[in-house]
């Protein structure tokens, strides 16, 4: 099943956010990423893990999963390259770089993001937007066209107490609010941007979504930019 | 390693004020909570409050609100809890504990005597 | 606040015994989550409380696997399956799931 949702979202203006990627498997959708380079594609690392003997491609240029958009166009994979410290069991290091076969045509659709490059926390309230095709609802309903959702930054010091992440939330992650909006498994791979920046990529743990105890989990990539460079270098 | 470590004893007398601090290394000091537990001479353990080390923002459980005041040195990795106007009934160990995973992390304690 | 009532007060017990520690809520301390945060802890004569199990069941790291927890709803149990001389001490358990969190008034585990 696609590891995403989108929950209390709405749908995104169409292709608004040209950098957004849906990672495929199989020539379905399977997780969110984000263009951050002409070839290059970030997602979580999670994601490939039941992907062993499937083909997985990403798709740019995409409003829609289904109907035909002139600024659509999937690429196979030349390398898929996951942090080398990331493990199935645990929620740090969810980082993937996609190497896509070619270099993407850009356009006003298909455009790579700025990412975050200062290691320092996004301030607490600051409200970010996140994206996915993931499902809408708990009861499962997916959605054919991208949803958006603005989420407000929680500190890591309550996102850290028992009943959230139980100091589970090292300097390397951050937190989102959760309280009927909120990102989940299936958008997992997704960019969360603050300021028009990419800040976050939405993790792909096994996580309750919409309670407000339990906050969105995303990866800093401040915090990996030495390793993002050493891959597209 | 991760390490709690509170000030010494205090000996105070009732109407006093005494300010306990617990320094905390091995670990991101903001990126945790800090909780004070209180333990009676012989007696159980009581949950004070918590402050978070990212906002500053104390909360404190009903029976210590108005005296108790918890407070930050976050350059110094420092909690402090502070108690004023003294009773007898505020002789007790305090403990700081961190926030996560559980309550895992406890500084060693710290005897506060409130006797005229 | 959540009333967590332990029994017994006092345990005495020889060593290689069997342990069982009881604790009731006053209220089922189940979280919106999922999760029930009931925790139980050992502090030693003179030194702090030392966690030895969360969400009812689990080991924290480095306890020995004698200790056990189970339990649902309101009714909670620690066992020690064979009690050692390091075992000894007082025994809390403490329910995190309600603010304010709030601990038993504790079992003397001791030497018969």
């Known amino acids: 099943p696609p590891r995403g949702r989108i929950l209390g979202g709405r749908e995104a203006e169409a292709h608004a956010r040209p950098y957004m990627a849906s990672v495929q498997l199989n020539g379905a959708h399977l997780c969110g990423g984000v263009l951050v380079a002409e070839q290059w594609v970030l997602s979580a690392a999670h994601c490939l893990e039941d992907a062993a003997d499937g083909k997985v491609q990403v798709l740019l240029g995409a409003h829609s999963l289904s109907q035909p958009e002139p600024s659509k166009r999937l690429y196979d994979v030349l390398r898929a390259v996951p942090h080398p410290d990331s493990q199935p069991d645990t929620i740090d290091h969810d980082l993937l770089l996609l190497q896509l076969s070619e270099k993407a045509t850009l356009g006003p659709a298909v455009r790579p993001l700025p990412w975050q490059r200062v290691d320092r926390d996004v301030a607490p309230g600051t409200l970010c937007d996140v994206a996915g095709w993931g499902i809408v609802n708990h009861a499962g309903r997916r959605p054919d066209s991208l949803q958006h959702v603005l989420l407000p930054v929680l500190d890591r010091a309550t996102c850290n107490r028992r009943t959230h992440h139980d100091g589970a939330i090292t300097e390397r992650l951050m937190c989102a609010e959760s309280n009927r909006r909120d990102s989940c498994k299936g958008d997992s791979g997704g960019p969360l941007v603050c300021g028009g920046v990419l800040e976050g990529v939405v993790t792909s743990g096994s996580r309750v979504c919409g309670n407000r105890k339990k906050p969105g989990i995303y990866t800093r990539v401040a915090s990996y930019a030495a390793w993002i460079d050493s891959v597209l270098a | 390693q991760i390490q709690l470590v509170q000030s010494g004893p205090e000996l105070k007398k009732p109407g006093e004020t005494v300010k306990i601090s617990c320094k905390a290394s091995?670990?991101?000091?903001?990126?945790?909570?800090m909780n004070w537990v209180k333990q009676g001479p012989g007696k159980g353990l009581k949950w004070m409050g918590w402050?978070?080390?990212?906002?500053?923002?104390?909360t404190y459980a009903d029976d210590f609100k108005g005296r108790f005041a918890f407070s930050l040195e976050t350059s110094a990795s420092t909690a402090y809890l502070q108690i004023s106007n003294l009773k007898n009934e505020d002789t007790a160990t305090y403990f700081c504990?961190?926030?996560?995973?559980?309550?895992?992390?406890w500084g060693q304690g710290t005897l506060v005597t409130v006797s005229a | 606040d959540v009333l967590m009532t332990q029994t017994p007060l006092s345990l005495p017990v020889s060593l290689g015994d069997q342990a069982s520690i009881s604790c009731r809520s006053s209220?089922?301390?189940?979280?919106?989550?999922?999760?029930?945060?009931l925790e139980w802890y050992l502090q030693k004569p003179g030194q702090s409380p030392k966690l030895l199990i969360y969400k009812v069941s689990n080991r924290f790291s480095g306890v020995p696997d004698r200790f056990s927890g189970s339990g649902s709803g309101t009714d909670f149990t620690l066992k020690i399956s064979r009690v050692e001389a390091d075992d000894l001490g007082v025994y809390y358990c403490f329910q995190g799931s309600h603010v304010p969190v709030t601990f038993g008034a504790g079992t003397n585990l001791e030497l018969k």
């Open positions: 209220l089922i301390i189940e979280h919106s989550d999922g999760n029930t945060y």
């Open positions: 504990v961190r926030d996560g995973p559980g309550f895992a992390y």
């Open positions: 091995g670990y991101i000091f903001r990126n945790y909570g």
């Open positions: 402050i978070n080390t990212y906002t500053g923002e104390p």
